[in-house]
């Protein structure tokens, strides 16, 4: 009669994560008479899986009636399979003996290998703000992974980018792997409404890449502009003076007048009008007395936006232009008109 | 193509330990058995002991207590540490790879390091 | 322990010429799945060891076919079909069958 051969089938497979491998062995012959075990791995430090005549093995099932007489499949099941898992089983033939068991021959073997899917890319942009024109890093992170290759992309707003570095760890072998990626975006004044979007191709996903976003609104600080201009006359002896700040994001604004030099007031932004591409912007009046003036007025507008270093921008008043009349109702203190409305929306 | 390659100090001290690093570079740490193995000057090649893929180590009775060979599969690496080092230990280290198809035994240490020597002096 | 033990410890040769070394284990290097767990290494001058020929008989990878390995049990030969002067240097038989691995104390090729 012939020897008895052990048949493994699947020189490979591939399990999903969570999901059960079922591992393939038949043999030819019910002679000679002795158990089937199952190894991970050969020599000597291989490691039992499943023992037909002894152990418990909870995760592992027969896929035949191995009580039956005439049974030649020893196929096994393993369930809930988790990338630890991966290698390679061997289906091995013992033939009966005293004390032990004799190994007799063993199959070729069959290489599991664990598929898990990255886990949701998470994307994080710069601990501070930058402003427009400066160039900023964004990271992506994925895990959990197996096997190890893997695609990433990066994209601002739909415009695929080019400028970034990526690492996938470990460099060895490993039961799953991370992806890490720092990608270099460069600010314009228009990315308030921007995203920037990691994107994770895997052979797990089926062609559905999972993705990660960042809103540029966490990231860029567009700084204002100023515009100081004098309104014409409101009263005879009142000149309206207004500031306008423009194109700022984000919101927080805070601003001052000065006379001279020396602080009038001060306002926090409300009531903001926004722009199309998602900046904002306010206007700020004051109404000057000018017959309390003897000499020209310096009038400062200074704007402290987001806990930036303040700017400012200035404008002459000419008393002279507005000649006193002796019969106004001019009472002695601050030289603004404290009654006139403080700020608007422009 | 897999290739293996030594690190570590040539000199060590009497009564030190000997520390030496095994990369592996262009192949995989699965499967394989990764092996440590001397040679000291003029004479044959002696077994100190491997590490298999998933953990478990194998030592020379004789070098057991003094030897401890470690797998860090996440930089494709293996090391070998031995205590208290006498002139008896100089020799060339290889590191090198041990392979196992099936059943219970080896099939040949095929690929090698180029060797490291190490000289136990004062 | 498994010991080895080659002979002849030297052996001088002739290019062109075929060459043979013996190795015996203590024990049988035989399985019981039928596969013998003997190596044969080379390791030439100044160089590391490498692999000829595993499980007995078969040539490892690259090895040119003027190496060839029998035997079976505890009684192993290899054997040089036409030396070349490549092919100096010491031969080594090891058994992989269980720990600790062992090797034999080498036979030193030299050309004549």
């Known amino acids: 009669e012939e020897e008895l051969q052990v048949i493994q089938p699947d020189k490979s497979i591939s399990v999903a994560a969570g999901e059960s491998a079922t591992l393939h062995c038949t043999v030819t012959s019910l002679i000679p008479v002795g158990p089937i075990q199952w190894f991970r791995g050969a020599g000597p430090g291989r490691e039992l899986i499943y023992n037909q005549k002894e152990g418990h093995f909870p995760r592992v099932t027969t896929v035949s009636d191995l009580t039956k007489r005439n049974n030649m499949d020893f196929s096994i099941r393993i369930s809930n399979i988790t990338p630890a898992d991966a290698g390679t089983y061997y289906c091995v033939k013992f033939r009966k003996g005293s004390p032990d068991h004799v190994e007799f021959k063993s199959g070729a073997g069959t290489e599991l290998s664990v598929r898990a899917k990255p886990s949701a890319p998470v994307v994080s942009g710069p601990a501070a703000r930058a402003t427009p024109q400066h160039t900023v890093s964004f990271t992506c992170e994925s895990h959990g992974f197996s096997p190890r290759d893997i695609t990433l992309k990066w994209f601002k707003n739909g415009n695929e980018l080019s400028d970034f570095q990526t690492n996938v760890d470990p460099a060895g072998d490993s039961v799953s792997y991370s992806i890490h990626s720092t990608a270099k975006v460069v600010l314009t004044r228009e990315d308030v409404h921007s995203q920037v979007i990691c994107e994770v191709a895997h052979v797990t996903l089926q062609g559905d890449p999972l993705r990660g976003t960042a809103n540029l609104s966490e990231t860029i600080r567009v700084p204002p502009t100023l515009e100081v201009t004098q309104q014409p006359v409101r009263a005879e002896n009142q000149v309206n003076v207004t500031c306008q700040v423009r194109k700022f994001y984000p919101q927080r604004l805070q601003l001052t007048w000065l006379e001279n030099g020396n602080v009038s007031r001060t306002e926090t932004a409300s009531t903001l009008t926004e722009n199309k591409d998602g900046t904002y912007n306010w206007m700020s009046w004051l109404l000057v007395n000018v017959s309390a003036h003897r000499d020209d007025v310096k009038l400062t507008c200074q704007v402290e936006h987001d806990g930036q270093p303040a700017v400012s921008k200035s404008h002459d008043l000419k008393v002279s232009a507005h000649p006193k009349e002796q019969g106004s109702n001019t009472a002695p203190g601050p030289a603004l008109a404290s009654a006139a409305p403080l700020g608007g929306s422009g | 193509q897999v290739q293996l390659q030594e690190s570590g100090p040539g000199l060590v001290k009497p009564s030190e330990t000997l520390s030496l690093t095994c990369t592996v570079s262009?192949?995989?740490?699965?499967?394989?058995?990764w092996s440590w193995i001397r040679q000291p000057p003029g004479k044959g090649l002696e077994w100190i002991g491997f590490?298999?893929?998933?953990?478990?180590?194998f030592y020379q009775s004789s070098l057991k207590s003094r030897v401890t060979i470690s797998l860090d599969t996440s930089k494709n690496q293996f090391s070998l540490k031995m205590t208290s080092v006498t002139a008896a230990d100089t020799a060339v280290y290889y590191c090198?790879?041990?392979?196992?198809?099936?059943?219970?035994?080896?099939?040949?240490?095929?690929?090698w390091g180029q060797g490291t020597t190490v000289t136990v002096s004062s | 322990d498994i010991v080895m033990t080659q002979s002849p410890l030297s052996l001088p040769v002739t290019p062109g010429e075929p060459a043979s070394i013996s190795c015996r284990s203590s024990?049988?290097?035989?399985?019981?799945?039928?596969?013998?767990?003997l190596d044969w290494y080379l390791q030439r001058p100044g160089q590391s060891p490498q692999l000829l020929i595993y499980?007995?008989?078969s040539r490892a990878s690259g090895v040119p076919d003027r190496f060839s390995g029998s035997g079976s049990g505890t009684d192993f030969t290899l054997k040089i079909s036409r030396v070349e002067a490549e092919d100096v240097g010491v031969f080594y038989c090891?058994?992989?069958?269980?720990?600790?691995?062992?090797f034999g104390q080498g036979t030193k090729v030299e050309i004549k």
């Open positions: 499980g007995g008989s």
């Open positions: 024990q049988s290097l035989l399985y019981s799945t039928g596969y013998t767990y």
């Open positions: 090198a790879r041990v392979r196992a198809y099936s059943g219970i035994g080896l099939d040949g240490t095929d690929v």
């Open positions: 590490i298999y893929y998933n953990g478990r180590t």
């Open positions: 262009g192949g995989s740490i699965r499967d394989y058995y």
């Open positions: 090891g058994q992989a069958l269980q720990t600790p691995l062992t």
